[in-house]
């Protein structure tokens, strides 16, 4: 019962976690404009893994996708890859874990097979959670680095003067969603691995017992001929099996003190 509960809970926790990872990956608020120095900004900017958005104080919002893969920072590509790998592994893990659930009967699937599937899905959830946590952490590191590097400077550029505004970006909601979701997926995976131990059928250690007829040496020779053990004559009146049908009298014609115990 405890195993089923652990497995079920692990599945549910992982399901919530993976849903969170998908949500975080799709969210636009990975980095949001820091309004500490300029709280009365007419236009507010926030960015995600796939597009950048601007929002007016009126609430009107416009989002545009990033130009090309080539023009984007390598770190952003790495974050995208980590999140997608996390989602894919998590989705496969969920699929595997559905069939592994103890409460679901599929044909004549043995407990050992279910245990293996539970372990497999558990490992997948753990890796999925780690991918999500790693992806979010890499992006957070980019933000922190950028935050301290963004200092206002003026320089002359082509077509006039360009001023790099003191626009600093800070952690968006998606980062927190990603961290929590990754953690839940990881916990769910650990729970599945724990449940696997309980599902695995314990091997019964049978003590090796040697069964032998007390005092009888049985030699077999086909054709109904009486045979000895093959080593000398049958001096000790040992019971002989001839493979044929015999009467009760014949059976008792070779009495031995060990015959009846």
């Amino acid at each position: 019962m405890a195993v089923t509960a652990c497995q079920g809970l692990g599945f549910v926790v992982s399901l919530i976690g993976i849903a969170g990872i998908i949500a975080a990956t799709c969210m636009d608020q990975w980095s949001t404009q820091d309004l500490y120095n300029n709280p009365v900004t007419a236009v507010f900017n926030y960015q995600g893994l796939w597009r950048s958005c601007v929002r007016e104080s009126s609430g009107f919002t416009e989002c545009r996708g990033y130009f090309t893969l080539l023009g984007l920072p390598a770190m952003l590509q790495a974050v995208r890859a980590l999140m997608i790998v996390g989602i894919v592994l998590g989705a496969i893990g969920l699929l595997v874990s559905i069939f592994a659930l103890k409460c679901i009967r599929i044909g004549s699937m043995e407990d050992s097979a279910k245990a293996n599937m539970t372990l497999t899905s558990g490992i997948m959830f753990i890796v999925s959670g780690l991918c999500a946590i790693a992806g979010v952490s890499v992006f957070a590191n980019m933000l922190v680095t950028n935050f301290w590097m963004s200092t206002a400077n003026m320089y002359t550029g082509m077509g006039g003067m360009v001023q790099t505004v003191q626009t600093r970006y800070t952690f968006g909601a998606a980062l927190f969603v990603g961290w929590v979701a990754g953690g839940l997926t990881l916990i769910g995976g650990v729970m599945m691995c724990i449940a696997c131990r309980g599902l695995a059928p314990e091997e019964t250690n049978y003590k090796a017992v040697s069964y032998h007829a007390s005092g009888h040496s049985v030699a077999y020779k086909p054709g109904g001929f009486k045979a000895s053990t093959g080593f000398g004559s049958n001096t000790k009146n040992k019971k002989i099996y001839d493979g044929g049908a015999r009467t009760e009298d014949e059976v008792q014609s070779y009495p031995s003190k060990h015959d009846y115990v």
């Epitope: 980095s31 007016e56 984007l72 505004v165």
Partner: nanobody, 120 residues
Amino acid sequence: AVQLVESGGGLAQAGGSLRLSCAASGRILNMASMAWFRQTPGKQRESVALITFGGTTNYADSVKGRFTISRDNAKNTVYLQMNDLKSEDTAVYYCNADVVTGLMRRDVYWGQGTQVIVSS
């Protein structure tokens, strides 16, 4: 980089009209807002009008009711329709664009300026 090219400046009679335009080109992800500033010799650059990407406008008190700012989002172009011109409107007019150019990159770009002279 983003380039801003102003056009439409020149000589106008008091009470007359001029239409300035500013085209932005280059690596523009989001055009947050575009604005017009002006500067007269010996004075600081002052804001004339601003328009956000959503069309929200803001004008300096001295030009309210006379100037109209508009924009074409598809062309990343901003226009300043100046009516009922006065001699105090004589200045170099600068185009300004607040642009998101990439991931965690938001810059303010300036044009080279276009001269507007109002003769009385």
